[in-house]
Interface confidence: medium
């Protein structure tokens, strides 16, 4: 009952990052959804599509996937775009297993997030490197800016919009007023006025065994939204928790193995042992999910001598919610749960 089994580690070298400007747009805004959600086959999750628009039946192992048609996260699937170079537009749903990656001669472990350069944030998943651009939300030129244009500014990674008058002379600084919206065009002002935002952690991608949970945060020097990830394991897959429910009881909210253990990840072992708590199960179709938790840093040591650390969900307490409206998707209603204020650090 470790974080994950320890599979053999393979290296896979993806193609260098390509310009993705020619990718087709699978999302259309405003959203256009059918009047009623689809009925999914038993065991297939009903989820919100990747455009965050409509309900859809999640794509399954081997199905084609796009930014709109996403793979079933509750089955540990991800969209492998490696067969669609250089567009990375249409992928195939594949299983997340512990396979490492190599990019530009650097080895990354499965699940590891990294920045090969300042313009991309990448994650190694089962030998494939998936990258998201970090230069999406460029501060636009101020309103009525004369001759706006995009330029590369020394010391700044992403291109910036500048106004002709900003570029040709230093702008005088003046006391800042609160406008209907602040439209001053300096990059520094954007950073100084950055409103820190961190989203809640997403539900764990699997209902048992090793999964991934993500959140978006702009708490960084650039004030750019970046995705953070942490490992999570709500309950072991190889323990039938139902058998541990005491007679006359309907639920076992928390399951904690008696022995402490080391976590393993992609063949690497945690440097210290832990005695984690897991969420249990309920007999009456209710979902058992964490409501008190935090994120801990776990250090791993690999056989080849390399080490790394990973953020991991640490469960303190779970509860069985009132109902699971959709039996196909135990996470569908997480947003409507009462706010139990998960400890986010």
């Amino acid at each position: 009952t470790a974080l994950s089994p320890a599979p053999t580690t393979m290296d896979f070298t993806p193609a260098p990052l390509e310009d993705t400007s020619s990718r087709p747009q699978f999302c259309k805004w405003p959203c256009e959804c059918p009047p009623s959600p689809p009925r999914c086959p038993l065991g297939v999750s009903l989820i919100t599509d990747g455009c965050e628009c409509c309900k859809m039946c999640a794509q399954q192992l081997g199905d084609n996937c796009t930014e709109a048609a996403i793979c079933d996260p509750h089955r540990g699937l991800y969209c492998d775009y490696s067969g669609d170079r250089p567009r990375y537009a249409i992928g195939v749903c594949a299983q997340v297993v512990g396979v490492g990656c190599v990019l530009d001669g650097v080895r990354y472990n499965n699940g590891q997030s990294f920045q090969p350069n300042c313009k991309y944030n990448c994650t190694c998943i089962d030998g494939a490197v998936g990258c998201t651009p970090l230069c999406l939300r460029v501060r636009p030129p101020r309103l009525w800016c004369p001759h706006p244009r995009r330029v590369s500014i020394p010391g700044h990674c992403c291109e910036q919009w500048v106004c002709e008058d900003d570029a040709k002379r230093p702008r005088k600084t003046a006391p800042r007023d609160t406008g209907a919206f602040d439209a001053v065009g300096e990059v520094e002002a954007w950073h100084r006025n950055c409103i820190a935002y961190t989203s809640p952690w997403s539900p764990c991608s699997t209902s048992c065994g090793l999964g991934v949970s993500t959140r978006i945060s702009n708490v960084n020097a650039q004030c750019w939204p970046e995705q953070e990830s942490r490992l999570c394991n709500l309950r072991p897959c190889d323990v039938d928790i139902h058998t541990l429910i005491k007679a006359g009881k309907k639920c076992l909210a928390v399951y904690q193995p008696e022995a402490s253990m080391n976590f393993t990840l992609a063949g690497c072992i945690s440097t210290r042992s832990y005695q984690p708590k897991y969420c249990g199960v309920c007999m009456d179709n209710r979902c058992c999910i964490p409501y008190k938790s935090k994120t801990i840093d776990v250090s791993f040591q690999c056989p080849d001598g390399l080490g790394f650390s990973r953020q991991v969900l640490w469960i303190n307490a779970c509860f069985c919610n009132l109902s699971c409206r959709n039996p196909n998707d135990i996470f569908a209603d997480l947003e409507s749960y009462p706010d139990f204020s998960e400890i986010a650090n």
Epitope: P140, W144, A183, V184
Partner: antibody
Framework: QVQLVQSGREMKKPGASMKVSCKAS????????ISWVRQAPGQGLEWMGW????????HYAQKLQGRVTMTTDTSTSTAYLELRRLRSDDTAVYFC??????WGQGTLVTVSS | QSVLTQPPSVSGAPGQRVTISCTGT?????????VYWYQQLPGKPPKVLID???DRPSGVPDRVSGSKSDTSASLAITGLQAEDEADYYC???????????FGGGTKLTVL
């Protein structure tokens, strides 16, 4: 609070010139540039140009080049719009607006013989 | 004729959702220039609803949202109310004209 107060309505003859003022208050005048936008009766909005209140640099709409002049007086925190060789289709409400998203109340200029 | 094309009018019943489109070209919206949305009530100056960051300035209700893709943009208003009846304009920069351009405007009628 931030305010842009414009001069009163004007009646002009074709071929004449007009000059509309826009007095700013409630913020540092040189912080924001000023744009001028006009709206003919029952019609849409038309951007006329922009002036930096900081250094007087201007940026005019191509169709008005040669007829329009925008100026500022930092001592009185006032921006001015001058339009020459007026025609009947210049009849409109003229608005000033700063880079911060604030607008004046508008000045109606009627051009008629 | 504006280089940013908007439908002359749209209408919806109270509580409904309406969208107003703004179609441009490769020299304005398609070039990545920001788009602003304005509401103008009769006899009043325009008021910004969506700024160039696709954000709502303070005081604009979250019933209002903007989106942009390629050479078009749209403004969506949900939970339509009587006070939403007004003219709506999109605004962007056009590199060909070397200036800021408004869409032709859309009159929203709440039935």
């Amino acid at each position: 609070q931030v305010q842009l107060v414009q001069s009163g309505r004007e009646m002009k003859k074709p071929g004449a010139s007009m000059k509309v003022s826009c007095k700013a208050s409630g913020y540092t005048f040189t912080k924001y540039g000023i744009s001028w936008v006009r709206q003919a009766p029952g019609q849409g909005l038309e951007w006329m140009g922009w002036i930096s209140a900081d250094n007087g640099k201007t940026h005019y709409a191509q169709k008005l080049q040669g007829r329009v002049t925008m100026t500022t007086d930092t001592s009185t925190s006032t921006a001015y719009l001058e339009l020459r060789r007026l025609r009947s289709d210049d009849t409109a409400v003229y608005f000033c607006a700063n880079d911060g998203g604030y607008w004046g109340q508008g000045t109606l200029v009627t051009v008629s013989s | 004729q504006s280089v940013l094309t908007q439908p002359p009018s749209v209408s919806g019943a109270p509580g409904q959702r309406v969208t107003i489109s703004c179609t441009g070209t490769s020299s304005n919206l398609g070039a990545g220039f920001p788009v602003y949305w304005y509401q103008q009530l009769p006899g009043k100056p325009p008021k910004v609803l969506i700024d160039g960051n696709n954000d709502r300035p303070s005081g604009v209700p979250d019933r209002v949202s903007g989106s942009k893709s390629d050479t078009s943009a749209s403004l969506a208003i949900t939970g339509l109310q009587a006070e939403d009846e007004a003219d709506y304009y999109c605004l962007s920069y056009d590199s060909g004209l070397d200036g800021w351009v408004f869409g032709g405007g859309t009159k929203l009628t709440v039935l």
